[in-house]
Amino acid sequence: AGVFELQIHSFGPGPGPGAPRSPCSARLPCRLFFRVCLKPGLSEEAAESPCALGAALSARGPVYTEQPGAPAPDLPLPDGLLQVPFRDAWPGTFSFIIETWREELGDQIGGPAWSLLARVAGRRRLAAGGPWARDIQRAGAWELRFSYRARCEPPAVGTACTRLCRPRSAPSRCGPGLRPCAPLEDECEAPLVCRAGCSPEHGFCEQPGECRCLEGWTGPLCTVPVSTSSCLSPRGPSSATTGCLVPGPGPCDGNPCANGGSCSETPRSFECTCPRGFYGLRCEVSGVTCADGPCFNGGLCVGGADPDSAYICHCPPGFQGSNCEKRVDRCSLQPCRNGGLCLDLGHALRCRCRAGFAGPRCEHDLDDCAGRACANGGTCVEGGGAHRCSCALGFGGRDCRERADPCAARPCAHGGRCYAHFSGLVCACAPGYMGARCEFPVHPDGASALPAAPPGLRPGDPQRYL
């Protein structure tokens, strides 16, 4: 387990000609915020594919109003880091997408308007625990300067955060075959990578990824005492001199949730349930109103009636929590029949049916699907005596073995070419057209029919603003 950290240094006009218009004006003040999406490996998946390593949204930056006649300067940035926690091993190679969003603060009906100003993407190698890596990326006429690093959360160490360190049991040396844990020379490398969060005092493992408890302790991470009143005689390295068992440290000890948030232990870490007006991993973000866009995952924000209830998020199906930040485990209702495997895709539930069954909930018993496999989460559907696969999002073909083409819908207008780039679809416009999807003609005088072109978009510019 660990955290990927992103520090934005500047966002402003890049070098060279064609400085972009300021995204804000006296009539329409605005502020910036950033979103980062991480995917493991050298992903060639489109930008629409899930951020499998995680995603994070920054706070809003200071309000900015353009000075009339002045060129766009570096724009004021939000404070702090963007942090993307990862639960498992750090993959070493990853793809990133960083989006710069503009929040217009004019008199829009229904609250602030958001628009994507720029998107940059790349693929990088990065070892956890290393120094900050600096980067510069350009999107049209904009330039984004940032640094990033991945760091392990104790007790994990190593370039992939897969080695665990524990305090030495003896003052002088580590156990047989175990090395000191650089840079923590007073700690020793653990012999096995147990399940993340497994109590080092009360848990152990004989297979990687498991967490088995010493006598007197229970719970998925061995942090819950079987009984705090009885005096047991625990075996193992944490044997108390009194022989009495005391509760081991748990992730909620000391309540990491600020501002009255309540902490609940999860199999891998902890989760804060925040009171209204607060959100964030530890309920640390406060003073929030609908103008701050606190509702995630498409939640609708409604202003509260009093200061203690500054806003209420009405969550879309599949999400819950005061900020719609928690995905509802709709599979817990066991909607898939006949032994089907339930997949919660976020936008929909999908049942992966056993051979011989089909239908949205595996309710149809079909002989013609028996023994026919649909790959990549596709389901077999009866089709007049022949089997047909209904493929999961992102896949196609007779057996769902082909990755679906983000260009299949022909999104690039006027003969523009669509390319399936790893950072998302890319349009290369035919001569005479421009815009995100080649939708605007370029007039002979060089002007375009673009009503209000996104900053940095020039004739012949590729798709960068999804």
Epitope: G16, G18, E44, I136, Q137, R138, G140, A141, G396, G397, E402, R403, A404, D405, P406, C407, A408, R410, R417, C418, Y419, A420, H421, F422, S423, L425, V426, A428, C429, A430, P431, R458, G460, D461, P462
Partner: antibody, heavy 119, light 110 residues
Framework: QVTLRESGPALVKPTQTLTLTCTFS?????????MGWVRQAPGQGLEWMGT????????DYASWAKGRVTISVDKSKNQFSLKLSSVTAADTAVYYC???????????WGQGTLVTVSS | DIQLTQSPSFLSASVGDRVTITCQST????????LSWYQQKPGQPPKLLIY???NLEIGVPSRFSGSGSGTDFTLTINSLEAEDAATYYC??????????FGGGTKVEIK
Amino acid sequence: QVTLRESGPALVKPTQTLTLTCTFSGFSLSSSYDMGWVRQAPGQGLEWMGTIYTGDYSTDYASWAKGRVTISVDKSKNQFSLKLSSVTAADTAVYYCARHTGYGYFGLWGQGTLVTVSS
Amino acid sequence: DIQLTQSPSFLSASVGDRVTITCQSTESVYGSDWLSWYQQKPGQPPKLLIYQASNLEIGVPSRFSGSGSGTDFTLTINSLEAEDAATYYCQGYYSGYIYAFGGGTKVEIK
């Protein structure tokens, strides 16, 4: 493993038509790419010959290659091919196939195949 | 026809030197930044170093960097290493789905 591999004759006689094949694996033409041919004469630089766009199988050629070069795709065999007509000694080169997936760069290349034009 | 001119065509430098190669196009590349740089060693296909003028390809050492837009571009090797001896090519993509390569710059280690 995503790979490209060129194949074809090592020796061609002048005036004949050279046919080369690029076999790809690890990806499918159901996605949209430019599949291109680039050649390099001994001791010389790289020269783009042409590309075929898998979205609609339209082709684009270098100005010198128009009328001499034909690029086509056989989707069922996971191959695309190059035909170069009326070859001369000046067409002696290493021929590479390459893939473009956006932003104008060839991110994947074959190892290349040397073709000598000689009688 | 579009021409990409690289200069110099040959350079000799010592390990640790900062090396700069320029690439000038007779037309603006598509989107102002659809220009890439490749390294080629004898008997091998070109290897992508930089795409979109300044994006470092995965696995390429950070001593390589690219800059520029429109018609003028630069590849910089910050601290030359012995393994960097190779020929370097720029390549542009242009409106009308046209590709072009520069003539190449051979880098030799003194």
